[in-house]
């Protein structure tokens, strides 16, 4: 009797279990009682990444330089092109369809994780003992200057945005 289900890498059509086309190939004709499934390789600018019965291959993704994109990995007949962003930019989504400039960490915040082509800068507030007085996409919070190691004393306390101000020790004794 005609099958109602087929094995892995097969599909059911016209009461026949036909072989799926392998990745990198598209379906030209279904199998029949007397013939195999016929498949053809995808052209150079196309791909199919699964066992399939698609009659058209998918176009490789275009990494549009106008959107700040560049090719990270060229596509094959079995894989799509992978785009990444130019230096100083990162993807706006997982599929990386466009890029935006990396965020800078404002004064009072330092870089916890430097941005990559696919992730933005991660900032963190400078904890007590650390400061950042610049807006930067690279600089971490810096520690306050240690006045003691310079035989100096704190004349002005530091904040998360400013370093301490050191000054000479008062030599007058009470």
């Amino acid at each position: 009797e005609p099958p109602t289900a087929c094995r892995e890498k097969q599909y059911l059509i016209n009461s026949q279990c036909c072989s799926l086309c392998q990745p990198g190939q598209k379906l030209v004709s279904d199998c029949t009682e007397f013939t195999e499934t016929e498949c053809l390789p995808c052209s150079e600018s196309e791909f199919l990444d699964t066992w399939n019965r698609e009659t058209r291959c998918h176009q490789h993704k275009y990494c549009d330089p106008n959107l700040g994109l560049q090719v990270q990995q060229k596509g094959t007949s079995e894989t799509d092109t992978i785009c990444t962003c130019e230096e100083g930019l990162h993807c706006t989504s997982e599929s990386c369809e466009s890029c935006v400039p990396h965020r800078s960490c404002l004064p009072g915040f330092g870089v916890k994780q430097i941005a990559t082509g696919v992730s933005d800068t991660i900032c963190e507030p400078c904890p007590v003992g650390f400061f950042s007085n610049v807006s930067s996409a690279f600089e971490k919070c810096r520690p306050w200057t240690s006045c003691e190691t310079k035989d100096l004393v704190v004349q002005q306390a530091g904040t998360n945005k400013t370093d301490v101000v050191c000054g000479p020790q008062d030599r007058q004794r009470a």
Partner: antibody, heavy 112, light 112 residues
Framework: EVQLQESGPGLVKPSETLSLTCTVS?????????WNWIRQPPGKGLEWMGY???????NYNPSLKSRVTISRDTSKNQFSLKLSSVTAADTAVYYC?????WGQGTTVTVSS | DAVMTQTPLSLSVTPGQPASISCRSS???????????LNWFLQKPGQSPQLLIY???NRFSGVPDRFSGSGSGTDFTLKISRVEAEDVGVYFC?????????FGQGTKLEIK
């Protein structure tokens, strides 16, 4: 339902060309399948002559050398057989077939 | 070419009794994908061949379940579990794995 119907002259002179046409209804010959010509000499078995595929490409039985040509007319949903330089040995019932469906056959006699 | 040899060439069976026909190929009919394109046909007197079994063991639509096919590689069998009067005719095997397609010489089934 798929139906195939052979047509053509029943009598061909030796050395001439035998020409038959198969008209298909119920299925487009350019959709899929291989469209075959098969013959059966009187009192003998079946012999595959060749086919034309849904895409128009061919395959022929080498035993018929280069005497056989199968072509098609997709606008009429027909495919045709030409067999050149016939002899009495080509006298047979000629069938067109998709293999799951066959024409009723047409008898061709080669005689002067 | 794949030469197809059928045995026996004739068979006389009492209605209700089983019948078995063998078809042996001179080369394996299994292709590189592991599929085997061996088919069985019945040609009733005065008619075109009709498909019974395709791909070794698949019954074509409308074929009674008393017909079954089996085998692999080079050896194949058609079985009729209980022969009926309407089963008379010539049974052919046909391989379409290799070009040229080739038929067995036929087995004539008669009713006792």
């Amino acid at each position: 339902e798929v139906q195939l119907q052979e047509s053509g002259p029943g009598l061909v002179k030796p050395s001439e060309t035998l020409s038959l046409t198969c008209t298909v209804s119920g299925y487009s010959i350019s959709s899929n399948y291989y469209w075959n010509w098969i013959r059966q000499p009187p009192g003998k078995g079946l012999e595959w002559m060749g086919y034309i595929r849904y895409d128009g490409s061919n395959n022929y039985n080498p035993s018929l050398k280069s005497r056989v040509t199968i072509s098609r007319d997709t606008s009429k949903n027909q495919f045709s057989l030409k067999l050149s330089s016939v002899t009495a040995a080509d006298t047979a019932v000629y069938y067109c077939a998709r293999l799951d469906y066959w024409g009723q056959g047409t008898t061709v006699t080669v005689s002067s | 070419d794949a030469v197809m040899t059928q045995t026996p060439l004739s068979l006389s069976v009492t209605p209700g009794q089983p019948a078995s026909i063998s078809c042996r190929s001179s080369q394996s009919l299994e292709n590189t994908n592991g599929n085997t394109f061996l088919n069985w046909f019945l040609q009733k007197p005065g008619q075109s061949p009709q498909l019974l079994i395709y791909r070794v063991s698949n019954r074509f639509s409308g074929v009674p379940d008393r017909f079954s096919g089996s085998g692999s590689g080079t050896d194949f069998t058609l079985k009729i579990s209980r022969v009926e009067a309407e089963d008379v005719g010539v049974y052919f095997c046909l391989q379409v794995t290799h070009v040229p397609f080739t038929f067995g010489q036929g087995t004539k089934l008669e009713i006792k």
